[in-house]
Interface confidence: low
């Protein structure tokens, strides 16, 4: 009976989310494998988040809007492990917007989700950021490694969206 009510709850939750995401990919989690964590298909999952790589070339603002429409934000990178996971799925000759910007050009970088900007957990390429006119951050492959670079926000780039996993 308990299992039956859990299944009914899950199904109703799934129906609710299907309005927004036509397809979800779910995996069993938790110590009793009773919880399901889901990401929209074809998003990828890492720890408690889902990631989507958009190959549409858009300005930073349009890229953030594009993520918002999908219930996400431009990616906020919190650890080296997270960055390493994300970059496995990126093309080395492309650049991708991050959810990191410096709106006034005062070198006050801020994440879109208001996560505090921690200088000790940043992955800028050598010599970056290097221009107060370049107020948005991208991740790209340079000098044999992935890192961040400040670029102009209006210039179209690909982008990475991130959202919390859906638990049902």
């Amino acid at each position: 009976n308990f299992m039956y009510s859990k299944t009914v709850k899950r199904l109703s939750k799934l129906q609710e989310y299907q309005q927004y995401y036509p397809s979800l990919t779910c995996v069993m989690e938790g110590k009793d494998m009773e919880d399901w964590s889901c990401c929209p298909t074809p998003w990828t999952s890492f720890q408690s988040s889902c990631y989507f790589i958009s190959t549409v070339m858009q300005s930073w603002t349009k890229s953030q809007n594009n993520c918002s429409v999908m219930g996400a934000d431009l990616v906020v990178i919190n650890t080296k492990e997270e960055q390493d996971f994300i970059t496995q799925n990126l093309k080395i000759n492309s650049a991708y917007f991050l959810g990191l910007s410096d709106p006034k050009g005062w070198r006050h970088w801020q994440w879109v989700d208001q996560t505090p900007y921690n200088k000790n957990v940043t992955f800028w390429h050598s010599g970056e950021p290097n221009s107060p006119d370049e107020r948005c951050a991208i991740i790209n492959f340079r000098s044999e490694e992935w890192g961040w670079n400040d670029v102009h926000c209006h210039v179209p780039q690909k982008s990475i969206c991130k959202m919390k996993k859906i638990y049902i």
Partner: antibody, heavy 120, light 106 residues
């Protein structure tokens, strides 16, 4: 196959006006910033103007600001350069160019060029 | 505005000779691109993002550099390499080209 074909170059008197066109094909035109670059008779390359993918932002060097206007028609895959108050130093071969698909941008395709001569 | 100075402006090389063309920026930059132009044709992308060869560029060409100093090197000059070479930078919102290096065959 990506193709950029410029047209409209001519002999114009100082102070005159002229409009150049660039017909693009073989790629999604509206996905790219587009550029005009000129080459002087002394073989120096100079950028003249560029325009954002939707046409809402335009950029010019001080040498042509206020005299040249770049525009685009995404429905017709065409780039334009309206030039006015022309000077003898505007004499050059004018190239239409596209930037590479990803940062850091370089000019991956160029047209064959169209020649402008400003002389009385 | 960043100024790009190419040297030499004109140079001649014998077939099989190693050739190096340099591009000096007036302040430190992150990238440099190179174009080749032959008489009567439009410039062609040759080396992009410092060291990546554009499609169809022979492996005898290489690019290197950092900061304010960048170079294009031909390991062994061939007749078809005679051309003008330009370095280029996009330092938003300005696009800058070097003055060009005219490479001739000796």
């Amino acid at each position: 196959e990506v193709k950029l074909v410029e047209s409209g170059g001519d002999l114009v008197q100082p102070g005159g006006s002229l409009k150049l066109s660039c017909a693009a094909s073989g790629f999604t035109f509206s996905d790219y910033y587009m550029y005009w670059v000129r080459q002087t008779p002394e073989k120096r390359l100079e950028w003249v103007a560029y325009i954002s993918y939707s046409g809402d932002s335009t950029y010019y060097p001080d040498t042509v600001k206020g005299r040249f206007t770049i525009s685009r028609d995404n429905a017709k895959n065409t780039l334009f350069l309206q030039m006015s108050r022309l000077k003898s130093e505007d004499t050059a071969m004018y190239y239409c160019a596209r930037h590479s698909p990803s940062f850091p941008y370089y000019f991956d395709y160029w047209g064959q060029g169209t020649a402008l001569t400003v002389s009385s | 505005e960043i100024v790009l100075t190419q040297s030499p402006a004109i140079t001649a090389a014998s077939l099989g000779q190693k050739v190096t063309i340099t591009c000096s920026a007036s302040s430190s930059v992150s990238y440099m691109h190179w174009y080749q132009q032959k008489s009567g044709t439009s410039p062609k992308p040759w080396i992009y993002e410092i060291s990546k060869l554009a499609s169809g560029v022979p492996a005898r060409f290489s690019g290197s550099g950092s900061g304010t100093s960048y170079s294009l090197t031909i390991s062994s000059m061939e007749a078809e390499d005679a051309a003008i070479y330009y370095c280029q930078l996009w330092n938003y919102p300005l696009i800058t080209f070097g003055g060009g290096t005219n490479l001739e065959i000796k």
